[in-house]
């Protein structure tokens, strides 16, 4: 069978080999497609309601106006010519429709190196067959559940047309150290050949990079943490990162229901006071951050470090804030 | 109309450096990438890397990652290539070519000769 | 890398003849294929994009094919101004490959 492509809702004829070119003829056109059950039988004769699907024209061609979904299939034609010499037409058609231009939709301005991010989404309405999406970073064509790349698909047929619409919502993770502004198109591929892919028009998100924090240092006067009934404990939390982040405190591994501050001063220590501090660093584009935790305590007159253990009491005393 | 003008013919001592331009008219020149090719005397086509002047991402064929230099100047609509430590194997036509991101080449300048001898 | 690879350096041809060059990708390249014509002393011209659509002022003597790995270039009625090299292209993935060339010479 010789096979014939044709766009949906344009018009299409199909040649009668053989077949003298005027009337009286002898053919016949036999048509297995989606509008038939087996096969139906079309002559020159015609009339019904066939006429407006199919119908045979004067030089036995066959002419259909608009071809639809449903004209895929086979079309056979019969004829004899004027010496009775039979000819045999056998054609197989299938039908495309080209969408429009792709589009990326919700698209990201902004990526995070390091992490999942959601690129965009792109879609494409009204083709047939379905065809399929496919992304492109910089030139490369992105393999899906490689490096970092995931993409979900889906497609849906709409009930009255039979179009297809399709949607691939891509999703990747950038290195850290790599392009700072990738180039992200997206293209459809027809599912018949001979018609071009068509190409969204490329989106160019920046890709941002956190910068690690770095350690959380939580310096304590006097050095050591120990000091005398009714001395003085600073303990400052020194964090690089930039914006200053938020401060809170921790006593034996409680918060402190205290108002962030990079400085705990810790007038008059009493017994209430032995315990174990850290602070807590929270910055608005990471997680909290702990340092390492020192331990206050009291020296008894005579001693010459911190007592053994930590005497009980949950009170805070007099705590002050800088 | 679209044009791509490139630079003059150079002649280079061997470990020489050399430094050709492409100046882009009749289209937004950040909205397409620029592409070089080598081209020997009676050889075939050799894709060395491109250069996208919106974001100034750049990318090289392996062997011309040390060889080749992409660069855009986006206030003179330019594109240039550097080539350092010549040798004789540089000795090429070089061609500059646009294309509409990672699409087919559709506009190309008319070549820099290069001619590497002692 | 995708490696093309044009089977024919050379072909002898006849003015007013049909000639058929063809280009091998060593991957599946979804019809990203481009055709290039270069006559010595000049630039490449763009022919075909798409593996088979002709650019604007292109003459309709020349039609490209295809799909998957094989592509071909075909020019019928051969004019005396085809006598040149053509290249295939894919672009599908960088680094972008071209083909060896095929040169045309008349018999």
């Known amino acids: 069978a010789q096979n014939i492509t044709a766009r949906i809702g344009e018009p299409l004829v199909l040649k009668c080999k053989g077949a003298p070119k005027k009337p009286p003829q002898r053919l016949e056109w036999k048509l297995n497609t989606g509008r038939t059950e087996a096969w139906k039988v079309l002559s020159p004769q015609g009339g019904g309601p066939w006429d407006s699907v199919a119908r045979v024209l004067p030089n036995g061609s066959l002419f259909l106006p608009a071809v639809g979904i449903q004209d895929e299939g086979i079309f056979r034609c019969q004829a004899m010519n004027r010496n009775g010499k039979e000819t045999k037409s056998n054609y197989r058609v299938r039908v495309y429709q080209i969408p429009g231009k792709p589009e990326i939709v919700d698209s990201a301005s902004e990526l995070t190196a390091g992490v999942p991010n959601k690129v965009g989404t792109c879609v494409s309405e009204g083709s047939y067959p379905a065809g399929t999406l496919s992304w492109h970073l910089d030139g490369k064509p992105l393999v899906p559940n490689e490096k970092g790349v995931s993409v979900k698909e889906q497609t849906r047929r709409h009930p009255e047309t039979g179009l297809f619409t399709l949607q691939s919502e891509l999703m990747v993770t950038p290195a850290r150290g790599g392009d700072p502004r990738p180039t992200f198109s997206c293209s459809f591929s027809p599912g018949l050949p001979r018609h071009r892919a068509l190409r969204t028009a490329p989106i160019q998100p920046r890709v941002w990079e956190p910068v690690p924090l770095e350690e959380v240092q939580l310096v304590v006067e006097p050095e050591g943490g120990a000091v005398a009934p009714g001395g003085t404990v600073t303990l400052t939390c020194e964090v690089p990162a930039q914006p200053s982040p938020q401060i809170h405190w921790m006593k034996d591994g409680v918060p402190l229901p205290l108002p962030p501050s990079p400085v705990l001063i810790l007038p008059e220590i009493g017994p209430q006071d032995q315990g174990t501090y850290s602070c807590v660093a929270t910055h608005s584009s990471h997680g909290p951050q702990e340092s390492r935790a020192v331990s206050i305590s009291i020296i008894e007159p005579g001693e010459e470090g911190p007592t053994a253990g930590s005497v009980g009491g949950s009170g805070l005393g007099t705590l002050a804030l800088a | 109309q679209v044009q791509l003008q490139q630079s003059g013919a150079e002649l280079a001592k061997p470990g020489a450096s050399v430094k050709m331009s492409c100046r882009a008219s009749?289209?937004?020149?950040?909205?397409?990438?620029m592409h070089w090719v080598k081209q020997r005397p009676g050889q075939g086509l050799e894709w060395i890397g491109f250069?996208?002047?919106?974001?100034?991402?750049?990318e090289y064929i392996p062997k011309f990652k040390d060889k080749a230099t992409l660069t855009a100047d986006k206030s003179s609509s330019t594109a240039y290539m550097q080539l350092s430590s010549l040798t004789s194997e540089d000795s090429a036509v070089y061609y500059c070519?646009?294309?509409?991101?990672?699409?087919?080449?559709?506009?190309w300048g008319a070549g820099t000769t290069v001619t590497v001898s002692s | 890398d995708i490696q093309m690879t044009q089977s024919s350096s050379y072909l002898s041809v006849s003015l007013g003849g049909r000639v058929t060059i063809t280009c091998k990708a060593s991957?599946?390249?979804?019809?990203?294929l481009a055709w290039y014509q270069q006559k010595p002393g000049n630039a490449p011209r763009l022919l075909i994009s798409?593996?088979?659509t002709l650019e604007t002022g292109v003459p309709s003597r020349f039609s490209g094919s295809g799909s998957g790995k094989d592509y071909t270039l075909s020019i019928t009625s051969l004019q005396t101004e085809d006598v040149a090299t053509y290249y295939c292209?894919?672009?599908?993935?960088?680094?972008?490959?071209f083909g060896g060339g095929t040169k045309l010479e008349l018999k």
């Open positions: 070519a646009r294309s509409d991101g990672g699409w087919y080449f559709d506009v």
């Open positions: 009749g289209y937004t020149f950040t909205d397409y990438w």
């Open positions: 250069i996208n002047p919106s974001t100034v991402y750049t």
């Open positions: 991957d599946r390249i979804n019809y990203w």
């Open positions: 798409g593996a088979t």
């Open positions: 292209q894919q672009y599908w993935s960088t680094p972008y490959t």
